[in-house]
Amino acid sequence: GTDSGSEVLPDSFPSAPAEPLPYFLQEPQDAYIVKNKPVELRCRAFPATQIYFKCNGEWVSQNDHVTQEGLDEATGLRVREVQIEVSRQQVEELFGLEDYWCQCVAWSSAGTTKSRRAYVRIAYLRKNFDQEPLGKEVPLDHEVLLQCRPPEGVPVAEVEWLKNEDVIDPTQDTNFLLTIDHNLIIRQARLSDTANYTCVAKNIVAKRRSTTATVIVYVNGGWSSWAEWSPCSNRCGRGWQKRTRTCTNPAPLNGGAFCEGQAFQKTACTTICPVDGAWTEWSKWSACSTECAHWRSRECMAPPPQNGGRDCSGTLLDSKNCTDGLCMQNKKTLSDPNSHLLEASGDAALY
């Protein structure tokens, strides 16, 4: 055969694709030291031949690193993981104003990549509130502002408000409002908002309660309508009459003010006196009639009854026999136009 089929080797082989810079799958997160418990900071990166922590600009001793290697399940790539512990003492030993911080540095053949800085702070929550809510008495339907400035803390304390030990949720009761500076606003105070209110501040270290503020929602009293005037005290002439009202519209509640003004009014009254009727004198006797009787009359006019006075009692007419019974009885007939007068006078007699 010939050499024509033989291959000529190149001066250099094409290189494998360049390894990329390390990429952080997990960067160290800010952490808080609670009491004396150290915190763990962790990094994961690929591709990475080495990962080390640097804290406050100083490399952390290799002995303080715990390193692991493994496969990332999602990508199948080889991943390097490293973690360190930071103690309370280390953080306290850092002098100056800057917080204690750590970051990871990862190497690959392509170079290095730095992670974000993670800050490590000692967590605390001071005991005393900067401002505690004050109890107050407020009128019904008015606005209430309860102020609370929680104790200084790291991390900053979250605040919630309790109403008689139940957490207030403004999404459930829109009459309540919480503000960014931790104030509680009651939009329109209802009687049911009379309660003990407590501001609670909490973070990962502790939970603190403010002094309890008692809110009393009161109702000032209001007068009812006046009742009708009573009858005049005297049936006749000058007297008094009165009317009353009550402090029940509404009645005072929760220490609200009693109604101002009078519950009772009195006024003079004059009732025109009734005049009872009285008889005039009897008239003279009439001449003796064919019926052998004579009459006399009187009127209820001395005076007549006035202003509801009583009528006269007794008869208007009086009659008596004028011939000692010697008249003939048959002269009286039923057709006699005056016969009804005799019938009307109950004490007249016929003979």
Epitope: V138, D141, E143, L145, T171, L177, T179, I185, R187
Partner: antibody, heavy 115, light 106 residues
Framework: EVQLVESGGGLVQPGGSLRLSCAAS????????IHWVRQAPGKGLEWVAS????????SYADSVKGRFTISADTSKNTAYLQMNSLRAEDTAVYYC????????WGQGTLVTVSS | DIQMTQSPSSLSASVGDRVTITCRAS??????VAWYQQKPGKAPKLLIY???SLYSGVPSRFSGSRSGTDFTLTISSLQPEDFATYYC????????FGQGTKVEIK
């Protein structure tokens, strides 16, 4: 019936002062927050300052801080806005309103800052 | 300060239309949002408080809702008297208003 009535507006030169009043009736101003809100001609609403007398609480917009002072005389049931070092950009109708959700407003008073 | 970004700045609609106005808060404002209606030369009027509570005397065609930091005012069926400018307002932090939405007749 709840009512708010503003007064005290007018024409003032730049650098001058003005005091606005907000007379309240139908409710006790001592137990309610009062807010001043302004509206420049043809513009939107801008919050200026707030007071809650019972808690001696006041707050101001950055644009007026140090120049304006909000106060209240609860015996007169009236809130005030003292405006000093006035600027042309303070020209607006000034409203007072009651409550954080401002359920009642006055009719407004016009403040014109011009030379 | 907390910003309230209101959109749209204006809209044209007809009587009977459903109208939606949105406000986005630059950070959490809880439910401390109110909506107002203002007509030319008049003071604003409260429509909605606490994001979704209808103020007394306001017609039920007005409603408010919240989704996170997004707040919506809806007019279910626009009436002739509803043509006006609408503002949102937050009072969770220092009070701020949206820029306003002018609802005009189409």
């Amino acid at each position: 019936e709840v009512q708010l009535v503003e007064s005290g507006g007018g024409l003032v030169q730049p650098g001058g002062s003005l005091r606005l009043s907000c007379a309240a009736s139908g409710f006790n101003l001592y137990y309610s927050s009062i807010h001043w809100v302004r509206q420049a001609p043809g513009k939107g609403l801008e919050w200026v300052a707030s007071i809650y007398s019972y808690s001696s609480y006041t707050s101001y917009a950055d644009s007026v801080k140090g120049r304006f002072t909000i106060s209240a005389d609860t015996s007169k049931n009236t809130a005030y806005l003292q405006m000093n070092s006035l600027r042309a950009e303070d020209t607006a109708v000034y409203y007072c309103a009651r409550g954080y959700a401002m359920d009642y407003w006055g009719q407004g008073t016009l403040v014109t800052v011009s030379s | 300060d907390i910003q309230m970004t209101q959109s749209p700045s204006s809209l044209s609609a007809s009587v009977g239309d459903r109208v939606t106005i949105t406000c986005r808060a630059s950070q959490s404002v809880s439910s401390a949002v109110a909506w107002y209606q203002q007509k030319p030369g008049k003071a604003p009027k409260l429509l909605i408080y606490s994001a979704s509570s209808l103020y007394s005397g306001v017609p039920s065609r007005f409603s408010g809702s919240r989704s996170g930091t997004d707040f919506t005012l809806t007019i279910s069926s626009l009436q002739p008297e509803d043509f006006a400018t609408y503002y949102c307002q937050q009072h969770y932090g220092l009070i701020t208003f949206g820029q306003g939405t002018k609802v005009e007749i189409k």
